[in-house]
């Protein structure tokens, strides 16, 4: 029995920063559960993880360097990345786990979400600013 | 009650390769990560790394060119190897539960490296 | 990687007091911290992870307080089976890495 994955095919990230929700067909509610995020298209790089353990504070943490957070829903898990880099544009998955009440559950592979980071533009100063206000 | 038992060669000779096995008993195997943590005589702690049931591994940089840590699921151990040790790894080997936090812990290994 | 320093590196309290251990890393690991004790000859026992989550089985009497780079794990009231070395160690940046410990010895 697999769990199912739903997710955005496709964010934006303005600000070099984005928000990644990442639902589930299974409520969390009073699991212990490990949901993480991976970039690449074989899942290579592990970007954030989120430990549940029932009514305990959520765990966030990455093992890769990324700046993450991430915040619990019932049936959800909501990833928050922050300075992105342009060329960490790419394919990210979402992953759970249930490791407590047995039996081990985790998901069927998602479709992934296409995270396109852009840089910030600076908008560059006039040539000849106006007359100054005082 | 997640219990965790360890064994392996307690003397070394330099050159050689440390061998250690950690065995889980009484938990889920799966969805955790497993980890090796080492203790110098008189000394503090240093990860050396883990591994999960599907074999995805961390390193320690400072260890990652010598060690090798392997999984076994149908028996629920996992492994420990060190490859050409010197006096420098003589000490306590433990094996935990955990990739961010340590518990339970194996009861420690003694390991010493001496010509 | 992340230094983490503990001091005082020996802390001498009589049974019955407070004792305060402080743990310092070199930059920002939010709450990403935990708390050891380790009596000689045994492994170390979680006692704090998440910078002030009590472990399973871990008494109230264990506290644990901060983030960023200052946290602290307090003793309300010491009991003669808490003469121990403590240890910090971080798990926001990898490899994790741990402080070098706090003896606490009785007074």
């Known amino acids: 029995n697999k769990i199912l994955v739903k997710q955005s095919p496709m964010l934006v990230a303005y600000d070099n920063a984005v928000n990644l929700s990442c639902k589930y067909s299974y409520n969390l509610f009073s699991r212990e559960f490990r949901a993480s995020l991976h970039k690449g298209l074989d899942s290579a790089v592990e970007v954030c993880v989120v430990y549940g353990n029932y009514s305990q504070q959520l765990q966030v943490y990455s093992k890769t360097g990324f700046n993450c957070d991430g915040k619990l829903g019932n049936e959800s898990v909501t990833f928050y990345l922050q300075n992105l880099y342009v060329n960490q544009t790419d394919i990210y998955f979402c992953k759970i786990e249930v490791m407590y009440p047995p039996p081990y559950l985790d998901n069927e592979k998602s479709n992934g979400t296409i995270i396109h980071v852009k840089g910030k533009h600076l908008c560059p100063s006039p040539l000849f600013p106006g007359p100054s206000k005082p | 009650q997640v219990q965790l038992q360890q064994w392996g060669a307690g003397l070394l000779k330099p050159s050689e390769t440390l061998s250690l096995i950690c065995a889980v008993y009484?938990?889920?195997?799966?969805?955790?990560?497993w980890s090796w943590i080492r203790q110098p005589p008189g000394k503090g702690l240093e990860w050396i790394g883990d591994?999960?049931?599907?074999?995805?591994?961390n390193f320690n940089p400072s260890l990652k060119s010598r060690v090798t840590i392997s999984v076994d699921t149908s028996k629920n151990q996992f492994s420990l190897k060190l490859s050409s040790v010197t006096a420098a790894d003589t000490a306590v080997y433990y094996c935990a539960k955990g990739e961010a936090w340590f518990d339970p812990w194996g009861q420690g290994i003694m390991v010493t490296v001496s010509s | 990687e992340i230094v983490m320093t503990q001091s005082p590196a020996t802390l001498s309290v009589s049974p019955g007091e407070r004792a305060t251990l402080s743990c310092r890393a070199s930059?920002?690991?939010?709450?990403?911290l935990d708390w050891y004790q380790q009596k000689p000859g045994q492994a170390p026992r979680l006692l704090i992870y998440g910078a002030s989550t009590r472990a399973t089985g871990i008494p109230a009497r264990f506290s644990g307080s901060g983030s960023g780079t200052e946290f602290t794990l307090t003793i309300s009231s010491l009991q003669s089976e808490d003469f121990a070395v403590y240890y910090c160690?971080?798990?926001?940046?990898?490899?994790?890495?741990f402080g070098g410990g706090t003896k606490v010895e009785i007074k």
């Open positions: 009484g938990g889920s195997f799966s969805g955790y990560y």
């Open positions: 160690q971080q798990y926001n940046n990898w490899p994790l890495t």
């Open positions: 591994i999960n049931h599907s074999g995805n591994t």
């Open positions: 930059q920002s690991v939010r709450s990403n």
